[in-house]
Amino acid sequence: MKVLQEPTCVSDYMSISTCEWKMGGPTNCSAELRLLYQLVFQSSETHTCVPENNGGVGCVCHLLMDDVVSMDNYTLDLWAGQQLLWKGSFKPSEHVKPRAPGNLTVHTNVSDTVLLTWSNPYPPDNYLYNDLTYAVNIWNENDLADSRIHNVTYLKPTLRIPASTLKSGISYRARVRAWAQHYNTTWSEWSPSTKWYNSYREPFEQR
């Protein structure tokens, strides 16, 4: 049994790091493999992650962590029974993929403005809480070519757009994702999308 593609890991910089790898042939990851991980710090205990299958030869493991500081380093050992298949290390702060924003809501009660709000996925004591910027994707349900991205580079998780910039009488969808500049992270996954109907009509004299 051997590793074809070594484990690569990303961290949400809060509580979960996800490691993925590929084996040389079909493998029952949860039955045959264990990923042991240990924080390189004061008598930290060794934790065991039971991997799941991710396709025929792929495995994925979710490493649980109580907290993260930027200097953290973990040793990783991939075992198949008594056989050590791979040994490596992982520094969460260097491989951050933020959590996806949540609770995306569209407010259309102000007649000429569409207000989108969402929740920051981190608590205030997490470094990423004040470091996230967002991208909001808005698209026309009936015309996928009518799609746009708004970059939100300020901290407040809100976006206002004039309703007049959207087609009237059309259903739109929006979703949002996040990244953190100081840790040069990858983008988060997109949030679940939310739908609304743009009922805005131009004032009569402008028609």
Epitope: F41, Q42, D67, M71, Y122, Y127
Partner: antibody, heavy 116, light 112 residues
Framework: EVQLQQSGADLVRPGASVKLSCTAS????????MHWVKQRPEQGLEWVGR????????IYASKFQGKATITADTSSNTAYMQLSSLTSGDTAVYHC?????????WGQGTLVTVSA | DILMTQTPLSLPVSLGAQASISCRSS???????????LEWYLQKPGQSPKLLIY???NRFSGVPDRFSGSGSGTDFTLKISRVEAEDLGIYYC?????????FGGGTKLEIK
């Protein structure tokens, strides 16, 4: 052996400032969060705030915002807390504590007495 | 801020007897990562506090097994199965799930 050595007791005048230090041995402060906890005479414990020494990111309890400033010098493995505009209500023992991810290691405490 | 309320304020016990201290939080202290960072500390006279229990039920290394923690949501309990003279002091619960982190008011364990 892990130790947090705090600076000695201080008697300070009302309105003045004081800077407390906490030097770690047996571990690197960059590997933890460093917190400060206030304990007034014959009273309970109050969380003041904390710092991630690597990036200097601080967070404070709202009642200590503007009162306490927590800093760290990773080259000397030391965390600091400055208290400003001191009043009699600031008379207390101040503990520095490392949290990873619980308060396993406490300093011996520094008594700050504010008196004219 | 989350208020941590400890009862009783003072707990007179006989050596060898069981002691139980309650800690109630004003709202849930489940962290957004799913863990509950509820801890118990003992402060003996003239000393700094020492960690006994973390994450509700886990004994810190070197803590005797007569100490046990339980609870969930907003209600938590520290039990000492057979009190010894060295257990005397003030016990504090603490929540490290939500900023600002907060301590309970303390429970003084004393000999009856």
């Amino acid at each position: 052996e892990v130790q947090l050595q705090q600076s000695g007791a201080d008697l300070v005048r009302p309105g003045a400032s004081v800077k407390l230090s906490c030097t770690a041995s047996g571990f690197n402060i960059k590997d933890t969060y460093m917190h400060w906890v206030k304990q007034r005479p014959e009273q309970g414990l109050e969380w003041v705030g904390r710092i991630d020494p690597t990036n200097g990111y601080t967070i404070y309890a709202s009642k200590f915002q503007g009162k306490a400033t927590i800093t760290a010098d990773t080259s000397s493995n030391t965390a600091y807390m400055q208290l400003s505009s001191l009043t009699s209500g600031d008379t207390a023992v101040y503990h520095c504590v490392s949290r990873r991810p619980w308060f396993a290691y406490w300093g011996q405490g520094t008594l700050v007495t504010v008196s004219a | 801020d989350i208020l941590m309320t400890q009862t009783p304020l003072s707990l007179p016990v006989s050596l060898g007897a069981q002691a139980s201290i309650s800690c109630r939080s004003s709202q849930s202290i489940v962290h957004s990562n799913g863990n509950t960072y509820l801890e118990w500390y003992l402060q003996k006279p003239g000393q700094s506090p020492k960690l006994l229990i973390y994450k509700v039920t886990n004994r810190f290394s070197g803590v005797p097994d007569r100490f046990s923690g339980s609870g969930s949501g907003t209600d938590f309990t520290l039990k000492i199965s057979r009190v010894e003279a060295e257990d005397l002091g003030i016990y504090y619960c603490f929540q490290g799930s939500h900023v600002p982190y907060t301590f309970g008011g303390g429970t003084k364990l004393e000999i009856k």
